[in-house]
């Protein structure tokens, strides 16, 4: 009967208690991307720094080959920011002539891969039209939300165009997840 | 042997359990900024409301002189939104003449200061070119991520131009952190 | 005296311990909006999917009639992203003529309703001017922060113009909250 004196009335007595510092967590930071092939009909995935500088993985959360590996089932908060930068797009030149046009765009997707599913699941998407006239432009897209994940799930960040990703600073482009 | 019946198999038995309501937390909201000097080569820091309206600090997390003081080592989720607003920029006037130009920009940085380190560490940066033609413009930059912090670390929010920060509403510009 | 051997020195002995998996949590995803009336002087509220696809509610957190119902007092992290899309705005046409103009805008507000308060409380606002020339445009607004909520509080997401909300994909527009 001991060990339950702190339990609020709505807690089932069999629910596991666990130390917060023991939960799977990762914060990954940007690196220069090397050319790699990607699946057709899918945006290319970014790879990440997992241990240097501000980056870390802990408590059985591991990073390998562009994927964060989920070591334990539960509800995770997942987030990413990608900073893009580019030159004047064709879109802006067409627009200067006054003709409406499907704009250029930048997109970030946080994707879940479950080995038993044939298709990845898109968890989060941030997508933005980019039509800046006559300049170098730069801007971030931020995403973050909570999802129920299963042990063995893998997470990755896909972008519409790897060549537009700002890889110069670890605080500008990053990806993380933690068990709640 | 009591008190461990809920412990999952991967938890070390010496790991501290603690009540969630006891964790350091803060949500700070915008105030009108007073003119203050800032360090050379560093964006000016914002100061904040810490107790009125939606703002609060609790469980030994304190706010003083633009800084959130970290009272306990651990992994923290840190976030901020800054809403900027301004008039037509010079950039847009140059762009109207059709000449590419380095655009004006708005930037938010969440910075960690550790007394034993000579230089602050930039944890998060959101930076965006602003080239809007012929109008008043306004837009937010949002940042959030998890970092391992040490007791005694201090957090602040720096912006590229304090005069562009929208300080009119507590829900538009804010800064917070909580121990995971 | 048992059950406290893991308690760190700063934890009050009467503080409740509880299993993380037992905490109220919800992630809601976008659905096509039906025409509904809304209060004067208040932006219209979105309604949401609460159980299909990526959406879920758990541990007494319920969704009903555009509201997330808070079942337990405490500190919650609340977040939302709304992706907007639209056609060329009047603003851009006026701007082409070179006259400064109050720009069109898109706004997201996360609002708290407490039955004992006559007025809703705006917790978070993301607002952005939109002045894109000659194109279809699209962009997200993301918000997230921590708030102290009371049992019985209700949360909703309001937008400046429901007709501009991208309801096509559950990963583009969403709303969530979880007890810390």
């Amino acid at each position: 009967l001991k060990g339950q004196e702190f339990a609020p009335s709505h807690q089932q007595v069999y629910a596991p208690l666990r130390a917060d510092g023991d939960k799977p967590r990762a914060h990954l930071t940007v690196v220069r991307q090397t050319a790699t092939q990607h699946f057709k009909n899918q945006f290319p995935a970014l790879h990440w720094e997992h241990e240097l500088g501000l980056a870390f993985t802990k408590n059985r959360m591991n990073y390998t080959n562009k994927f964060l590996l989920i070591p334990e089932s539960g509800d995770y908060f997942i987030y990413s920011q990608v900073t893009f930068r580019g030159m004047t797009s064709e879109c802006s030149e067409i627009r200067q002539a006054g003709r409406p046009n499907k704009p250029d765009s930048i997109t970030v997707v946080i994707t879940k891969v479950t080995d038993s599913y044939p298709e990845p699941t898109q968890l989060l998407m941030g997508t933005k039209s980019v039509c800046e006239v006559g300049s170098n432009w730069f801007q971030p897209i931020y995403l973050g939300a909570m999802f129920s994940l299963q042990e063995g799930d893998k997470l990755m960040v896909n972008v519409s165009d790897i060549s537009l990703v700002d890889y110069t600073k670890e605080d500008k482009t990053f990806f993380g997840a933690f068990l709640l | 042997l009591k008190g461990q019946e809920f412990a999952p198999s991967h938890q070390q038995v010496y790991a501290p359990l603690r009540a969630d309501g006891d964790k350091p937390r803060a949500h700070l909201t915008v105030v009108r900024q007073t003119a203050t000097q800032h360090f050379k080569n560093q964006f000016p820091a914002l100061h904040w409301e810490h107790e009125l309206g939606l703002a609060f600090t609790k469980n030994r997390m304190n706010y003083t002189n633009k800084f959130l003081l970290i009272p306990e080592s651990g992994d923290y989720f840190i976030y901020s939104q800054v809403t900027f607003r301004g008039m037509t920029s010079e950039c847009s006037e140059i762009r109207q003449a059709g000449r590419p130009n380095k655009p004006d920009s708005i930037t938010v940085v969440i910075t960690k200061v550790t007394d034993s380190y000579p230089e602050p560490t930039q944890l998060l940066m959101g930076t965006k070119s602003v080239c809007e033609v012929g109008s008043n413009w306004f837009q937010p930059i949002y940042l959030g991520a998890m970092f391992s912090l040490q007791e005694g670390d201090k957090l602040m929010v720096n912006v590229s131009d304090i005069s562009l920060v929208d300080y009119t509403k507590e829900d538009k510009t804010f800064f917070g952190a909580f121990l995971l | 005296l048992k059950g406290q051997e893991f308690a760190p020195s700063h934890q009050q002995v009467y503080a409740p311990l509880r299993a993380d998996g037992d905490k109220p949590r919800a992630h809601l995803t976008v659905v096509r909006q039906t025409a509904t009336q809304h209060f004067k002087n208040q932006f219209p509220a979105l309604h949401w999917e609460h159980e299909l696809g990526l959406a879920f509610t758990k541990n007494r957190m319920n969704y009903t009639n555009k509201f997330l119902l808070i079942p337990e007092s405490g500190d919650y992290f609340i977040y939302s992203q709304v992706t907007f899309r639209g056609m060329t705005s009047e603003c851009s046409e006026i701007r082409q003529a070179g006259r400064p103009n109050k720009p069109d805008s898109i706004t997201v507000v996360i609002t708290k309703v407490t039955d004992s308060y006559p007025e809703p409380t705006q917790l978070l606002m993301g607002t952005k001017s939109v002045c894109e020339v000659g194109s279809n445009w699209f962009q997200p607004i993301y918000l997230g922060a921590m708030f102290s909520l009371q049992e019985g509080d209700k949360l909703m997401v309001n937008v400046s113009d429901i007709s501009l909300v991208d309801y096509t994909k559950e990963d583009k527009t969403f709303f969530g909250a979880f007890l810390l």
Partner: antibody, heavy 124, light 105 residues
């Protein structure tokens, strides 16, 4: 085979700037997942990480020394240069450079080849 | 930011002894590396990523651990093993332990 060699002054005066060069062979700093790291060891004391620079131009410095350190690379010459300003007698140490490498993204960087070190004494 | 504490700092042992050195991290880490240093020489990689033997290192050396507690074990101490051993990790900027000197008893 992989070799690294540190070069620089054996004696510097307090307040002066130390410039050390690491010249290496057997690998290229333009190859993915390669880097060069500087480590120092005061006499009779433990190792201390100073800074490293990676194949993709990322630089990391010990936060406690960051304002004094600069690291740079010349890929064509197979050299990495470390400068440390405002030297003090407590900076007296053997300074090592080493290769950092990892097998793939997700594995951990290791310091698998080291130079023999150069003793730098700070004294007036 | 992450402190590594080795124990013991000094260890006297005889040839053939089983020797265990522990490294405690102030916060959980995923990987620990071990280096061996002999007097007047540069350090040498011994164990990487907690439990992997570096090239050319004898199999009497092994590493284990997770989270905040890591161990280097020498199953049967040989004369050439008398040296100082350092643990190392990269997270939140690289840190070394203070070293464990293994001496002849």
């Amino acid at each position: 085979q992989v070799t690294l060699k540190e070069s620089g002054p054996a004696l510097v005066k307090p307040t002066q700037t130390l410039t050390l060069t690491c010249t290496f062979s057997g690998f290229s700093l333009s190859t993915s997942n390669m880097g060069v790291v500087w480590i120092r060891q005061p006499p009779g004391k433990a190792l201390e990480w100073l800074a490293h620079i990676l194949w993709d131009d990322r630089e990391y410095s010990n936060p406690a020394l960051k304002s004094r350190l600069t690291i740079s690379k010349d890929t064509s010459k197979n050299q990495v240069v470390l400068t440390m300003t405002n030297m003090d007698p407590v900076d007296t140490a053997t300074y090592y450079c080493a290769r950092m490498s990892r097998n793939y993204y997700g594995s951990s960087y290791v310091m698998d080849y080291w130079g023999q070190g150069t003793l730098v004494t700070v004294s007036s | 930011d992450i402190q590594l504490t080795q124990s013991p700092s000094f260890l006297s042992a005889s040839v053939g002894d089983r020797v265990t050195i522990t490294c405690s991290a102030s916060s959980s880490v995923n990987y620990m590396h071990w280096y061996q240093q002999k007097p007047g020489k540069a350090p040498k990689l011994l164990i990487y990523s907690t439990s992997n033997l570096a090239s050319g290192v004898p199999s009497r050396f092994s590493g284990s651990g997770s989270g905040t507690e890591f161990t280097l074990t020498i199953s049967s101490l040989q004369p050439e093993d008398f040296a100082t051993y350092y643990c190392h990790q990269w997270n939140n900027y690289g840190t070394f332990g203070q070293g464990t000197k293994v001496e002849i008893k």
